[in-house]
């Protein structure tokens, strides 16, 4: 007789991702039997949510119903029917809440029930919204891409699933650039990680990882691009901000009151004779930088080395994936790729930059004004967090690997919060059987 | 748990300055502010001001402004404030509370006298 | 500076009866939907302890016995039934806008 195809034994996970700039959803799928092996969980849509982030609700709460129900429609085409009430639905918020609860945990508050009134509105088996610490975040973006690239897995294989993939089972670190914080992940090699704040212990398919994490509150990209200007337009002489993080030619007027709206920019904070002042780009990679790392205070340190603002970070090891904001500003600059060496990423920077912005606008038609004007700074930003902020060099730059996607399932920290949330790993080695189960009989 | 560990009693005289302190532990402490207190005669609660320990800004009553000083070491996860030109209205418990607009986790106090 | 007058300032109550106490602000503390009223307990030698925010959330621990309701300037915080350990001080305030105020307190004792 001929095998028939039994109905697929298959699990789905629904997991948030609430941003400082939006929100992702994102479906996990899995085989039922298999749930404790190592890379058997893999995305199968990821639905980017139309508009801001959640924090940005905080005046019209009303809409966060609406704002979400593209995507929660979408799931519920996904997932086949039969599956709903047994997924569990996620979300976790990240710096953007995290800066909103520190102006007010009511304003937090309310965001958060809203978006959980909405969310237990669908058929699916809703699990809570919370604001993630920034260690989770760290922690969770490390174990997504460990996972992903099999190195928890003991069985060491012949073949590399990504080009980048070495065949050891060395960790790789974890480096995620959001919106308003930016996480730095790793097993650092025989040292004390000097700051108990900083320090994880794991104990993952029967091996135990000491890990470092921290996340820099304020220095995702868009909450730096804010300190910068609130940092500039401080010695400004009048209501003309000239900029070098932008291209020459661009023009763009800012209220004073948003630059000062931000937890962020409190330290920067002064009464100005203006309420508005105008950025005017200048393009200049070598002045944008130089302004870039007033925002890292090197002078104090209280430990044997610091990342900056008096972080502990012990010396760089092994190999790092970039993901998120680093992997999309690197793409868009067309610098992801693992020929290019530090010195040409800053020579491409430099050119880049100095491009009149009429000339940047017709290259890129497509893009977002917005987005567009802002990817000098990103980029010239990510150069200098990287080399200045965590120390890596023109040599160690080989061992960053810009990474998107990893076997189809994005670099984020979203896969490793479910799969702990699921108790889908494991602390000890599950062990293994002769033969797995057949879907065919 | 969340506490808020404060400094010992101080006595100081008029004219003088001092400077207390407020250890946190159980949680984040560059994820919260942190203000300051005054509380005079058991009854008049009086709120100073607040600190970002995330970037040492920071935001007074202006009648405190110019003569407090608010300060954090986040690698100690300890917030401090100094009171200069103290006269005997400064005679007072001060209390350091985490939140942003709910105050839900206060230091024991820090009782300061003035007197010559 | 929104000025909060809280009344009474001394109030004796029987056991197993019920407290009010009430907050006035000169101006609305209300924003975004939110009320900006807290209610604080006070007992000799300790410091405030959070009974109420957004004028009507109880507190971690706080037992069902007190309730925090009013909108915009008028607020106002019941305990019933009343026990001998509510015996305290009581404090509205309001985190709206800076300067945050504090009301004068209402001393509660038993009677």
């Known amino acids: 007789t001929q095998n028939k195809a039994l109905p697929e034994n298959v699990k789905y996970g629904i997991v948030l991702d609430a941003g400082s700039s939006h929100t992702s959803l994102y479906i996990y799928k899995w085989p039922a039997e298999k749930e404790n092996d190592t890379g058997v969980v893999h995305q199968v849509e990821e639905c980017r949510v139309k508009g801001p982030g959640i924090s940005k609700f905080v005046q019209k709460v009303n809409a966060i119903g609406i704002y979400l129900t593209a995507c929660m429609e979408r799931a519920r085409e996904v997932i086949p029917r039969s599956q709903h009430q047994e997924t569990p639905v996620y979300l976790g918020a990240t710096a953007g809440m995290r800066l909103l609860r520190m102006e007010s945990e009511e304003l937090a508050d309310r965001v958060l029930d809203v978006v959980e009134r909405s969310l237990s509105n669908y058929p699916f088996d809703f699990q809570g919204a919370r604001i993630i610490t920034g260690q989770e975040e760290g922690a969770y973006g490390w174990i997504t891409i460990n996972y992903l690239l099999g190195k928890f897995s003991q069985k060491t294989r012949w073949f590399s699933i990504v080009p980048y993939e070495t065949n050891n089972q060395e960790t790789f670190g974890a480096l995620d650039l959001g919106g308003a914080s930016t996480q730095v992940t790793f097993v650092p090699q025989n040292q004390t990680i000097e700051s108990p704040d900083n320090a994880l212990q794991f104990r993952l398919y029967g091996k135990d990882y000491n890990v470092y994490t921290h996340s820099f509150l304020c220095y995702g990209k868009d909450q730096a691009l804010w300190q910068k200007l609130a940092k500039d337009i401080q010695v400004a002489s009048n209501e003309i901000l000239r900029d070098p993080c932008f291209h020459p030619g661009y023009k763009k007027v800012v209220n004073v009151s948003d630059l000062y709206k931000t937890p962020c920019t409190k330290r920067f904070e002064m009464t100005l004779p203006f309420q508005q002042f105008e950025i005017q780009g200048i393009g200049n990679y070598q002045q944008c930088h130089q302004s870039i790392l007033e925002l890292f205070n090197t002078s104090y340190c209280p430990y044997s080395q610091c990342a900056f603002n008096g972080i502990f970070l012990p010396p760089l090891q092994g190999d790092f994936g970039a993901f998120s904001a680093f992997y999309f500003v690197m793409k868009f600059l067309n610098l992801t790729s693992e020929k290019v060496s530090q010195e040409k990423v800053t020579e491409m920077m430099k050119k880049f930059c100095a491009q009149p912005w009429e000339e940047i606008k017709t290259s890129y038609a497509g893009v977002k004004e917005k987005y567009l004007s802002e990817y000098c700074f990103s980029g010239t930003y990510i150069l200098s967090l990287l080399l200045q902020g965590y120390h890596f060099t023109a040599d160690s730059w080989e061992h960053i690997h810009f990474i998107g996607k990893i076997q189809g399932s994005d670099a984020g920290w979203t896969l490793g919060y479910m799969l702990n949330l699921t108790n889908m790993i494991p602390a000890e080695q599950p062990l293994s059987t002769p033969l797995s189960h057949s879907t065919y009989v | 748990e969340v506490q808020l560990q404060q400094s010992g009693p101080e006595l100081v005289k008029p004219g003088a300055s001092v400077k207390m302190s407020c250890k946190a532990s159980g949680y984040t402490f560059t994820d919260y502010n942190m203000h300051w207190v005054k509380q005079s005669h058991g009854r008049t609660l009086e709120w100073i001001g607040y600190?970002?320990?995330?970037?040492?800004?920071?935001t007074f009553n202006q009648k405190f402004k110019g003569r407090a000083t608010l300060t954090v070491n986040t690698s100690s996860r300890t917030a401090y404030m100094e009171l200069r030109s103290l006269t005997s209205e400064d005679s007072a418990a001060y209390y350091c509370?985490?939140?942003?607009?709910?105050?839900?986790?206060w230091g024991q106090g820090t009782l300061v006298t003035v007197s010559a | 500076d929104i000025v909060l007058t809280q009344s009474p300032a001394s109030l004796a109550v029987s056991l197993g009866q019920r407290a009010t106490i009430s907050c006035r602000a000169s101006e609305s503390v209300d924003n975004f939907g939110v009320s900006f009223m807290y209610w604080f307990q006070q007992k000799p030698g300790q410091p405030p302890n959070l009974l109420i925010y957004?004028?009507?959330n109880q507190g971690s621990g706080v037992p069902a016995r007190f309730r925090g309701s009013g909108s915009g300037t008028d607020f106002s915080l019941n305990i019933h039934p009343m026990e001998a350990d509510d015996t305290a001080m009581y404090f509205c305030q309001q985190t709206k806008e800076v300067p945050y105020t504090f009301g004068g307190g209402t001393k509660l004792e038993i009677k």
């Open positions: 509370a985490r939140g942003g607009t709910r105050f839900a986790y």
């Open positions: 957004g004028a009507s």
């Open positions: 600190i970002v320990p995330l970037n040492g800004g920071s």
